[in-house]
Amino acid sequence: TFRDCAEIFKSGLTTSGIYTLTFPNSTEEVKAYCDMDMGGGGWTVIQHREDGSVDFQRTWKEYKEGFGSPLGEYWLGNEFVSQLTSGHRYVLKIQLKDWEGSEAHSLYEHFYLSGEESNYRIHLTGLTGTAGKISSISQPGSDFSTKDSDNDKCICKCSQMLTGGWWFDACGPSNLNGQYYPQKQNTNKFNGIKWYYWKGSGYSLKATTMMIRPADF
């Protein structure tokens, strides 16, 4: 059994694709996409957007357990990611594509999610990369919010206003789980797929991938 894609890579399975991972300290399993090509491989993909084929305006339970297809658009699941990152130091890489053919990334040298009792609060340190010098995930980290669980710092309900589950602040500079807008409809969309410190307020991105890997890989 494998805890993450880094373990799979180190076992000699170095082809990108869908693999079965096992929750730490349990027999519960989850299917994930492993990127074995990007930057040395061993990346466990925890989120992917590319075409709007999957609805990301989901409930707390769905974000907790995961949804979508690892071959396409999906969310791996907050509970698995929380358990995985609480017992080991992980880096988070966020890969972004715009509609003009440009790509950028943000790399956080330490990433973990608190447990459900703390609303899967995100913790990040050590930002580098090309998608902005300032973190587009508010610091210090926010609690996770969904349409049926409002944990943000806004009088409004950010998840309702901007759609999707995310670590909203009030409402903050990013939402990679926002409404997917096709090309030519992707500007001036404040509920789109946003990464402010790369593309600004109203720009909705073409594709996003969030992936994690042990810091000592």
């Epitope: 009088i155 409004c156 404040f190 307020s201």
Partner: antibody, heavy 121, light 107 residues
């Protein structure tokens, strides 16, 4: 205190252009989006667009697309709105206003005093 | 664009009266509604945002309510300085739009 001071009244001929300025003071200029709203005589308010002084990003009301350009000069904390190919129905008071948030164009908490632009032959 | 239909377009009232202004959105705008007061020759002034939150320094006689498509601004006891025009504004969807205004006049 937080203040937006706009340039003075203008009289323009049809087909001409006008550039209105809005100087901000009392806050960090790049921390908030700026919007432009106009009001024709005796009429309601009409949102024209916004500019993000932090990165120069803009978003325009489709009604004005191609005729309006919004810019900023962060060294002087000034926003500008240029409207081209003026028509008589562009006669209005033009307001700049600050949004309460950098990341979204929410509500407008501070307004300039307005600039009357009259378009007449 | 989302249409914001304000009513009434004008209302005559006396000092001390309770005045209610309504705004109806053409589609769901959650609670993304603000209210502004405008006096002749002056710029609008923010009163209420997120449908019911008073801006700093706004007297407690002003209150807002509503969600979805129906919103209300209430002035509980009209004061002489409240005679003005009031506008609702939705910022849920691009482009932001305003109601046509309600003029509160002295009876």
């Amino acid at each position: 205190q937080v203040q937006l001071v706009q340039s003075g009244a203008e009289v323009k001929k049809p087909g001409a252009s006008v550039k209105v300025s809005c100087k901000a003071s009392g806050y960090s200029f790049t921390d908030y989006n700026m919007v432009w709203v106009r009001q024709a005589p005796g009429q309601g308010l009409e949102w024209m667009g916004y500019i993000d002084p932090y990165n120069g990003g803009t978003g325009y009301n489709q009604k004005f697309e191609g005729r309006v350009t919004m810019t900023t000069d962060t060294s002087t904390s000034t926003a500008y709105m240029e409207l081209r190919s003026l028509r008589s129905d562009d006669t209005a008071v033009y307001y700049c206003a600050r949004t309460r948030d950098r990341y979204d164009v929410w509500y407008f908490d501070v307004w300039g005093q307005g600039t009357l632009v009259t378009v007449s032959s | 664009d989302i249409q914001m239909t304000q009513s009434p377009s004008s209302v005559s009232a006396s000092v001390g009266d309770r005045v209610t202004i309504t705004c109806k959105a053409s589609q769901d705008v959650y609670i993304a509604v603000a209210w502004y007061q405008q006096k002749p020759g002056k710029a609008p002034k923010l009163l209420i945002y997120w449908a019911s939150t008073r801006d700093t320094g706004v007297p407690s006689r002003f209150s807002g309510s509503g969600s979805g498509t129906d919103f209300t601004l209430t002035i509980s006891s009209l004061q002489p300085e409240d005679f003005a025009t009031y506008y609702c504004h939705q910022y849920s969807s691009y482009p932001p739009t305003f109601g046509g205004g309600t003029k509160v006049e002295i009876k």
